[in-house]
């Protein structure tokens, strides 16, 4: 689609005569008829296949024609066409005399023709005007012409339609040859594809507008190059989505079980020694004078029962003080004022004199103790069982019943079968009295969680169009990571292409 433009510049008819030689009365009131048609070697009458146009009366006899294009007038004359410009044409320009106001051909006498010119040739589309001058015996016509493309048409023949747009179907302007020139931030054949944020991961990221980076399932970060670990993963990382690979010192499916509490949290206070005692567990061994789980509290000095022989302990500002029962004295009521003559030994204890009778010592029968055999032996009072062991009196002896994971006479030895992380696939390890037990995450079984019991959700290749499949271990479901151009939970739908253009 284009326009043949004809610019009339000057017409000379000095004598003011018609083609017949007869003069015009009072002068030749001149208008023009233009006929544009296909190329003819010899221009002959017939249909104006490319179009016709007439002018009003432009002047009398000789005159210059004003350029009216800026004012919306009729010069240059416009001959639009709705086809591919063939590159050749024939042009007939007739000058007529209008005796009255009716310029229709049927209203004019046949001899009203002033002059007629006919040209033909080739003409390429372009902005430049071709100047021409045609002279007959009585008249001269100066004019110029050209062919230009209509709006949105481009190319040598005005055959390429291109309409700039900035919407869902494209983001471009048109080059002079009709090719698309994408707006900044867009690419692709029809400039529909946004150029994502620089560095946005090709597979794991995408965008719906320029300089954006949206992440596909399982990925995160400004450039979608960081995988998302398993939901609930506390102290772990991933190299592909939904993994949870534990950092050193952590265990369990979610890496939330602290295998090295002492190092991670330093809970023990006042110079106490910290020992890890299984998952998320520790024991503080307090320095003398401190107590509490974390040795965070001072110990009242009377708590260690320093007073002997039934003496009672009183806390004081500068320590403690023992109130001794009758017959005893000393800082801890350790000295006796009695002798064997006073029968000081209870519960069948036998008395032995010391220091020439100034002192004595009681030899107690089994199950009794104290300097006067006054106390029944409770071999558990000193709380000899370490690590939470339970002390049991067994007649003259005692026994420690240890918590799982501990052994030894006083439960002082830690037997952690879990220390070497025997449970596979993030299984949780539990120390038992006779070994260990693994609690397996969903999808695994066996004594050490070594058997994969769940059906691999990706095994059936559920993803289409070369999409990448990831298995979500927690739910035994799959996630498809679609390549560019496909959507849907299985990447089964192609993204809609723009409607084809009409050429």
């Amino acid at each position: 689609s284009g326009v043949f433009q004809l610019q009339l510049q000057e017409f000379i008819n000095e004598r003011g005569v018609l083609a017949s030689g007869r003069p015009c009365e009072p002068g030749c009131r001149t208008f023009f008829r233009v006929c544009l048609k296909h190329f003819q070697a010899v221009v002959s009458p017939g249909p104006c296949t490319f179009g016709t146009v007439s002018t009003p009366v432009l002047g009398t006899n000789s005159f210059a024609v004003r350029d009216d294009s800026s004012g919306g007038g009729r010069n240059p004359l416009q001959l639009p066409f709705n086809f591919t410009w063939p590159g050749t044409f024939s042009l007939i320009i007739e000058a007529w005399h209008a005796p009255g106001d009716d310029l229709r051909p049927e209203a004019l006498p046949p001899d009203a023709l002033i002059s007629k010119i006919a040209i033909q040739g080739s003409l390429a589309v372009g902005q430049n005007w071709l100047l021409d001058e045609q002279t007959s015996t009585l008249t001269r016509l100066r004019y110029s012409y050209r062919v230009i493309c209509s709006d949105n048409y481009y190319g040598d023949n005005c055959s390429r339609l291109c309409k700039k747009r900035n919407d869902h179907f494209g983001h471009y302007v048109c080059q002079p040859d009709g090719n698309l020139s994408c707006l900044p931030g867009w690419t692709g054949e029809y400039c529909q594809q946004p150029i994502c944020l620089s560095g946005c991961h090709e597979q794991n990221g995408y965008c719906s507008k320029p300089a954006e980076c949206l992440c596909r399932p399982g990925w995160q970060g400004r450039l979608c190059n960081e995988c998302i670990p398993h939901n609930g993963c506390r102290h772990g990382t991933c190299s592909t989505p939904w993994q949870c690979t534990c950092d050193e010192g952590w265990g369990g499916l979610f890496c939330d079980q602290d295998l090295n509490y002492c190092t991670h949290h330093s809970p023990c206070k006042n110079g106490a020694t910290c020992s890890n005692s299984g998952q998320r567990s520790y024991t503080c061994t307090c320095r003398p004078g401190y107590t509490g789980v974390d040795c965070e509290l001072e110990l009242s000095e009377c708590d260690s029962n320093p007073c002997r022989n039934g003496g009672s302990c009183k806390d004081q500002e500068d320590g403690y003080h023992c109130l001794c029962p009758p017959g005893y004295y000393g800082l801890h009521c350790e000295h006796s004022t009695l002798s064997c003559a006073d029968s000081p030994c209870f519960n069948g204890g036998s008395c032995r004199e010391r220091n020439q009778g100034a002192n004595y010592a009681c030899e107690c029968p089994p199950n009794f103790t104290g300097s006067n055999c006054e106390k029944k032996v409770d071999r558990c009072t000193s709380n000899p069982c370490a690590n939470g062991g339970q002390c049991l009196n067994r007649g003259p002896s005692r026994m420690c019943r240890c918590r799982p994971g501990f052994t030894g006479t006083y439960c002082e030895l830690h037997v952690s079968d879990c220390a070497r992380n025997p449970c596979a696939h993030g299984g949780t390890c539990h120390d038992l009295e006779n070994g260990l037990m693994c609690t397996c995450p969903a999808g695994f079984s066996g004594r050490r969680c070594e058997v994969r019991t769940s059906i691999d959700a990706c095994a059936s290749s559920p993803c289409f169009n070369r999409a990448t499949c990831y298995t979500d271990l927690s739910t035994d479901t799959f996630v498809c990571n679609c390549p560019y151009g496909f959507v849907g939970s299985r990447c089964e739908f192609p993204v809609g292409l723009p409607p084809s253009f009409p050429w």
Epitope: P267, V293, L297, E298, L299, D303, Q316
Partner: antibody, heavy 119, light 108 residues
């Protein structure tokens, strides 16, 4: 802000075991520096510290009550509990659960639950 | 155990007056590990002061604590109507943790 809520029977018979639970909300019981504590207040009297537990299971009791106490924690439910055996009328009190952080100053308290020991 | 004695048991003041509450320990409290609490009827205690003199965030600056060793003081510079309540001191230096028997601040 962490909130605490005590729950349990308001009436216990003598010689039986008193059982109370404290639920931690708007925060996790798995706080490294927190001591989850039980405190009681006898009617018209002062406050008495019972003992505490950490989320790791470590416990420390008031020596005067130790033989009758068992404090436990359930991190999955965000709760800790108190069991006191062989109760007498002298154990009638308002029982509070409280949180101490770092040192034993109690910055968050439950609203308290009245427990009466009576036949 | 460390016994804390608060005196007097009850004090009567008028709003706007300065109130001074005393807490004496049976043994020296190391690191000034002493706290003060306010308790109103039917409510749980509220922490006011820790470390003998550090005010808890959100507690009005009319409350101040002082003292060391065995003698400690809570001062309310200008009593407001909402300050009339029961006040307890607490030591957290030595096991078992102990509280004073309380001082009641009454309106005169």
């Amino acid at each position: 802000q962490v909130q605490l809520q005590e729950s349990g029977p308001g009436l216990v018979k003598p010689s039986q075991t008193l059982s109370l639970t404290c639920t931690v909300s708007d925060g996790s019981i798995n706080s490294v520096e927190s001591y989850w504590t039980w405190i009681r207040q006898h009617p018209g009297k002062g406050l008495e510290w019972i003992g505490y537990i950490k989320y790791t299971g470590g416990i420390h009791y008031n020596p005067s009550l130790k033989s009758r106490l068992a404090i436990s924690v359930d991190t999955s439910k965000n709760q800790f509990s108190l069991k006191m055996s062989s109760v007498t009328a002298a154990d009638t009190a308002v029982y509070y659960c409280a949180r101490a952080r770092g040192s034993h100053t109690f910055d968050v308290w439950g609203q308290g639950t009245m427990v009466t020991v009576s036949s | 155990e460390i016994v804390l004695t608060q005196s007097p048991g009850t004090l009567s003041w008028s709003p706007g007056e300065r109130a001074t509450l005393s807490c004496r320990a049976s043994q020296s409290i190391s690191s000034n590990y002493l706290a003060w609490y306010q308790q109103k009827p039917g409510q749980a205690p509220r922490l006011l002061i820790y470390g003998a003199s550090s005010r808890v965030t959100g507690i009005p600056d009319r409350f101040s604590g002082s003292g060391s060793g065995t003698d400690f003081t809570l001062t309310i510079s200008r009593l407001e109507p909402e300050d009339f309540a029961l006040y307890y001191c607490q030591q957290y230096s030595r096991s078992p943790i102990t509280f004073g028997q309380g001082t009641k601040v009454d309106i005169k």
